[in-house]
Interface confidence: low
C-alpha cells in the first residue's frame, strides 16, 4: 500500500480536517472541568482526574488508555503543624509572623484541601539567624556578595527573591554559600506589571500570593530514591540521606506583604547597585542583619513539611499507527497542579483533550496515523518531572529504539502577545511551515499566518525574517525524552510581550489565584490563543505521526552546531594566555561541524531523491532521521550529571529553566580563573572539547550513506 | 478526641512471638507516622519502631532490627508491631504513640496506656 | 544505652524553681528538635514541650523548654506536688535514623 492508501485521504486533507475539528469553545470547557478543585500531586482528587481523563480518551476513539503508576518521593506541608517564618527579639518572642495561607479568592473561600504555600522537598527544620538579601540567589549574585561586598553568608537565613533562574538553583547556591536557611519571595518588580490591577481585577499579584514550586536539583534523576529506574513496586529505594536532590536547608516562599516586613528592617551593607534593588518601599539593604533599633531581632523558620513515599499515576492513550505501529510521536504534558491549575498545566491539559479528541474523530471515520501516536497526562511533574521520567525510565528501550519525537504541552499560555516556541533544530523547519499554513489570532493581522505576527513580534536575534526558537532547557516534561533519551522535542505556548513585561513568569504562577477565571476574565476570553496553542502542537504531532519522510531537517542542526561553536571558542578566547600556555585549541570541534554540515547537506539531497515508494529505502531514511537526535547522546553523561547525556544541549547549571549549548565545555571553562589548579581545569576543558568534537563527528557518520 | 488503645500484651516464653495492635481513633491516621515506645519495669523510656505516614516507611531501634516488624493498616486504623525471638530484656509496657509531625519521628503528641509484654520462662 | 543524657534525679522545694538538663550531640540535638515528656507514677508519658520551646495546648506556662547547641533545658517553676514524675527529653537522631529518648530525671517536691 502506498501511505496515502494506507491514511486513507490525501495528507493534506487529514491535516485540514485535523485542524478544523479543534473548537475554542471545548478547550474552554475542558478547562473548566478541570480546575475547579485542586489535583495536587498523589491525592485522590488528582487520581479521580486520571481515571476520568482515561475514561474521556477511551470514548474519543484511542485504541487504548491505560493508567501507569509509581510510588515515587511527594513532600507535604504538616495539615497540623504549619510553616511559617518570624522575627524573634531578644527573648524570642516571636513579634511577627508569615502568613499561614493565601487568602482564597472569591467563591472558593470553601474548597478544600488547598495546599498552604510551601517549598517542595524542604528539609524539617527551624533555624535563626540574621537574614541576608542575596538578590536573585544567582551564581552571580553570590560572586558579588562574597567576592566584591565580602559579606559571608554562612550561618545567615537568606532571603531571595523569585525571578530568573529555577528556584532550585537558588536554594543549591545559598547552601554552597553556607546559608542555614532560604526565604523565596516575589517582588512586585519581577511579579507586578506597572498599571495593571491585582488578582480579581487583573492578572497581577496580590501582597498575599505565593509562588509554591519545588526546591530539587534533580538534574534528570526523577524519582529521588530511584534514579534511573522506574519507582515500581520491587523498585531498590535509596535512603533519605542518600536520595538525589534534596535540599539540606529549610526553605519557604512568601509573598511581598510578609517581605516587606522582613526587608523594612534590613541593615549591613547598602545594596550594590540598582539591579539589586526591587519595587517595595524598602532600602533593599543587603545585611547582614537588621539596622540599629533592631539590630537584636533575629529571623526564625519553622518548617515542618514531611516527604512521603507517594503513589502517582499517568494516563497514556495510544492510537496505533496504519504503517509503521513500532515508531512513536508522543504528545505529553501534565495534570497536576499545585492548586487549581489555571494556566499551569490545566491550560495544557485541556488543550491535549481537544487534541485527542480531534485525532479520535478522524479515526472514528477511519482514518489512522502512518506512525503510532502515544498521549500522555503526567503526574508529579511540579515535584520534579516525575510521573514523565518514570514512564521513561519504564520504557526507555523501547523509546530509544521507536521514539520519533516528543511534544510537549504544560500551560498553553504564559502571555497573549505572540507565540513561543523551544526545540530540537531538526523541529525548526516544521514550525516554521507549520505556522505559515495556521492564521494568526492577533490583533491587528487579521487573516495573516501565525508565522508573520510571531516573526513581527519576536524576531529571531540571528537570522532576520525569522521568528525567534529558543534552545530546550528543562524544568518541563520533555526533559527526560530529549536531555536523557535522545528523542527529538518540542514545546509551543504563547507568551507575553519580553521587552515591555520584565516579570519573570507570569505574576500569579503557581499561586491560588491561577484560576479558571484568570485565564476566561483577563488572558484569553475567547480562547482564541488556547486554540493556536493546539493548532500548533496538534499540527506538530500530525505531522510527525503522518508525513511519509520525517518532518526533520538535519541542515538546521549544522547551522546551529556552527553558532554554538563559535560562542563556545568566544568564551574561551576571553583567557588567550591560557589557551596558549595550555595548547588549547578548538580546531578539531570546528573541524567535525564542518563535516557534518556536508554530511547534512548531501544527506538531505538524497533525501529528497531517493524513491519514497520504496518502503525499505524510507524506512532507511527515516530511520537515519530519528536516531540523528540520538546521536548526541554521550552513554557516560556529563560531568556529576549522568541523567543529562546531550552533549549539544543540557539545563545551565546555574538555571534548570534556560538550555546551555556545548555544555560540557561551558561548564569546564566556567569561572576557571578562580580555580585552584588551573593545569587541572584547562585539561578539562580540553577534555570537554575532545568530546563535543567526537560526538559531533559520530552524529554526522549517522547521515552519511550506510554503504 | 484522640485515643489510642493497645492490646495483644501478655506473657511469652523467650524465643516466642507476640504481636501487639494499636487502634487508633480521632485523627486521619494515615496522615501521621506512628512509633511503638517501650518501658522497661522500674527503666526509663526506649523508643522502638516508627511506621511513616502514607508510605509505610520503616525504621528500628538497633536492639530489635530483624526481630521486630512494625506495620499499619490505614483502612482499619490499627497500627502492628509483630515480636519474634523475644528476649527477657524485651519485657516492657510498649506504648503507641502518634507522631505530631509526620513522616519520621518527630515528638509524640499523644500515648496510648500502654499493653505490658512479659518474657520469662 | 541512651545518647541522651540527663541528672537522675532534682529536686526542691514546693514554689521553687527546677531545670533539666539533657545533653547530646551535633547528630541529634545539634540539628534537631527536642521535646519533653512528662510521665506522672503509673501512667503514660504525656507531650510537654515540643520544638523546643513550645507548649502545648493545656500545658501551664510555668513550664518551659529551651535548647542550646547540643544540649537542652526544661524549666519549672512555681514547683507543684502534683510536678513530681519522670521527666524525659527527645529528639531524632540523624546518624542513627532513630528516635532517642533521655535517661530520664526524678523530681521529687520536699516536704
Known amino acids: 500500500k502506498s501511505s496515502s492508501e494506507a491514511t486513507n485521504i490525501t495528507p493534506k486533507h487529514n491535516m485540514k480536517a485535523f485542524l478544523d475539528e479543534l473548537k475554542a469553545e471545548n478547550i474552554k470547557k475542558f478547562l473548566h472541568n478541570f480546575t475547579q478543585i485542586p489535583h495536587l500531586a498523589g491525592t485522590e482528587q488528582n487520581f479521580q482526574l486520571a481515571k476520568q481523563i482515561q475514561s474521556q480518551w477511551k470514548e474519543f476513539g484511542l485504541d487504548s488508555v491505560e493508567l501507569t503508576h509509581y510510588d515515587v518521593l511527594l513532600s507535604y506541608p504538616n495539615k497540623t503543624h504549619p510553616n511559617y517564618i518570624s522575627i524573634i527579639n531578644e527573648d524570642g518572642n516571636e513579634i511577627f509572623n508569615t502568613s499561614l495561607f493565601e487568602p482564597p479568592p472569591a467563591g472558593y473561600e470553601n474548597v478544600s484541601d488547598i495546599v498552604p504555600p510551601f517549598s517542595a522537598f524542604s528539609p524539617q527544620g527551624m533555624p535563626e539567624g540574621d537574614l541576608v538579601y542575596v538578590n536573585y540567589a544567582r551564581t552571580e549574585d553570590f560572586f558579588k556578595l562574597e567576592r566584591d561586598m565580602k559579606i559571608n553568608c554562612s550561618g545567615k537565613i537568606v532571603i531571595a527573591r523569585y525571578g530568573k533562574v529555577f528556584r532550585g538553583n537558588k536554594v543549591k547556591n545559598a547552601q554552597l554559600a553556607g546559608a542555614t536557611g532560604v526565604i523565596l519571595y516575589s517582588d512586585p518588580d519581577d511579579y507586578f506589571a506597572p498599571g495593571v490591577k491585582s488578582y480579581p481585577d487583573g492578572w497581577n499579584l496580590p501582597g498575599g500570593g505565593v509562588q509554591r514550586g519545588n526546591i530539587l536539583n534533580l538534574n534528570g534523576a526523577g524519582d529521588p530514591l530511584t534514579p534511573g529506574y522506574p519507582a515500581n513496586e520491587y523498585a531498590y529505594r535509596r535512603g533519605m540521606a542518600e536520595a538525589v536532590g534534596l535540599p539540606s536547608i529549610p526553605v519557604h516562599p512568601i509573598g511581598y506583604y510578609d517581605a516587606q516586613k522582613l526587608l523594612e528592617k534590613m541593615g549591613g551593607s547598602a545594596s550594590p547597585d540598582s539591579s539589586w534593588r526591587g519595587s517595595l518601599k524598602v532600602p533593599y539593604n543587603v545585611g547582614p542583619g537588621f539596622t540599629g533599633n533592631f539590630s537584636t531581632q533575629k529571623v526564625k523558620m519553622h518548617i515542618h513539611s514531611t516527604s512521603e513515599v507517594t503513589r502517582i499515576y499517568n494516563v497514556i492513550g495510544t492510537l496505533r499507527g496504519a504503517v509503521e505501529p513500532d515508531r512513536y510521536v508522543i504528545l505529553g504534558g501534565h495534570r497536576d497542579s499545585w492548586v487549581f491549575g489555571g494556566i499551569d498545566p490545566q491550560s495544557g491539559a485541556a488543550v491535549v483533550h481537544e487534541i485527542v479528541r480531534s485525532f479520535g474523530m478522524l479515526k472514528k471515520e477511519g482514518w489512522r496515523p502512518r506512525r503510532t501516536i502515544l498521549f500522555a497526562s503526567w503526574d508529579a511533574e511540579e515535584f520534579g518531572l516525575l510521573g514523565s521520567t518514570e514512564w521513561a525510565e519504564e520504557n526507555s528501550r523501547l523509546l530509544q529504539e521507536r521514539g520519533v519525537a516528543y511534544i510537549n504541552a504544560d500551560s498553553s499560555i504564559e502571555g497573549n502577545y505572540t507565540l513561543r516556541v523551544d526545540c530540537t533544530p531538526l523541529m525548526y523547519s516544521l514550525v516554521y511551515n507549520l505556522t505559515k499554513e495556521l492564521e494568526s489570532p492577533d490583533e491587528g493581522f487579521e487573516g495573516k499566518s501565525l508565522y508573520e505576527s510571531w516573526t513581527k513580534k519576536s524576531p529571531s536575534p540571528e537570522f532576520s525574517g525569522m521568528p525567534r526558537i529558543s534552545k530546550l532547557g528543562s524544568g518541563n516534561d520533555f526533559e527526560v525524552f530529549f536531555q536523557r533519551l535522545g528523542i527529538a522535542s518540542g514545546r509551543a505556548r504563547y507568551t507575553k510581550n519580553w521587552e515591555t513585561n520584565k516579570f519573570s513568569s507570569y505574576p500569579l504562577y503557581h499561586s491560588v489565584y491561577e484560576t479558571y477565571e484568570l485565564v476566561e476574565k483577563f488572558y484569553d476570553p475567547m480562547f482564541k490563543y488556547h486554540l493556536t496553542v493546539a493548532q500548533v502542537r496538534g499540527g506538530m504531532v500530525f505531522e510527525l505521526a503522518n508525513s511519509v519522510v520525517l518532518p526533520f531537517d538535519c541542515r538546521d542542526y549544522a547551522v546551529v552546531l556552527r553558532k554554538y561553536a563559535d560562542k563556545i571558542y568566544n568564551i574561551s578566547m576571553k583567557h588567550p594566555q591560557e589557551m596558549k600556555t595550555y595548547s588549547v585549541s578548538f580546531d578539531s570541534l570546528f573541524s567535525a561541524v564542518k563535516n557534518f554540515t556536508e554530511i547534512a547537506s548531501k544527506f538531505s539531497e538524497r533525501l529528497r531523491d531517493f524513491d519514497k515508494s520504496n518502503p525499505i529505502l524510507l524506512r532507511m531514511m527515516n530511520d537515519q532521521l530519528m536516531f540523528l537526535e540520538r546521536a548526541f547522546i554521550d552513554p557516560l553523561g556529563l560531568p556529576d550529571r549522568p541523567f543529562y547525556r546531550h552533549v549539544i544541549y543540557a539545563p545551565s547549571s546555574h538555571n534548570k529553566y534556560a538550555g546551555e549549548s556545548f555544555p560540557g565545555i561551558y561548564d569546564a571553562l566556567f569561572d576557571i580563573e578562580s580555580k585552584v589548579d588551573p593545569s587541572q581545569a584547562w585539561g578539562e576543558v580540553k577534555r570537554q572539547i575532545s568530546i563535543a568534537t567526537f560526538t559531533v563527528q559520530a552524529a554526522a557518520e549517522t547521515l552519511s550513506e550506510v554503504a | 478526641e484522640v485515643q489510642l488503645v493497645e492490646s495483644g500484651g501478655g506473657l511469652v516464653q523467650p524465643g516466642g512471638s507476640l504481636r501487639l495492635s494499636c487502634a487508633a481513633s480521632g485523627f486521619t491516621f494515615s496522615s501521621y507516622a506512628m512509633s511503638w515506645v517501650r518501658q522497661a519495669p522500674g527503666k526509663g523510656l526506649e523508643w522502638v519502631s516508627a511506621i511513616s505516614g502514607g508510605s509505610g516507611s520503616t525504621y528500628y531501634a538497633d536492639s530489635v532490627k530483624g526481630r521486630f516488624t512494625i506495620s499499619r493498616d490505614n483502612s482499619k486504623n490499627t497500627l502492628y508491631l509483630q515480636m519474634n525471638s523475644l528476649r527477657a530484656e524485651d519485657s516492657a509496657v510498649y506504648y503507641c504513640?502518634?507522631?505530631?509531625?509526620?513522616?519520621?519521628?518527630?515528638?509524640?503528641?499523644?500515648w496510648g496506656q500502654g499493653t505490658l509484654v512479659t518474657v520469662s520462662s | 544505652q541512651s545518647v541522651l543524657t540527663q541528672p537522675p534525679s532534682v529536686s526542691a522545694a514546693p514554689g521553687q524553681k527546677v531545670t533539666i538538663s539533657c545533653s547530646g550531640s551535633s547528630s541529634n540535638i545539634g540539628n534537631n528538635y527536642v521535646s519533653w515528656y512528662q510521665q506522672l507514677p503509673g501512667t503514660a508519658p504525656k507531650l510537654l514541650i515540643y520544638d523546643n520551646n513550645k507548649r502545648p495546648s493545656g500545658i501551664p506556662d510555668r513550664f518551659s523548654g529551651s535548647k542550646s547547641g547540643t544540649s537542652a533545658t526544661l524549666g519549672i517553676t512555681g514547683l507543684q506536688t502534683g510536678d513530681e514524675a519522670d521527666y524525659y527529653c527527645g529528639t531524632w537522631d540523624s546518624s542513627l535514623s532513630a528516635y532517642v529518648f533521655g535517661t530520664g530525671t526524678k523530681v521529687t517536691v520536699l516536704g
Open positions: 504513640a502518634k507522631d505530631g509531625v509526620g513522616a519520621t519521628p518527630y515528638y509524640f503528641d499523644y
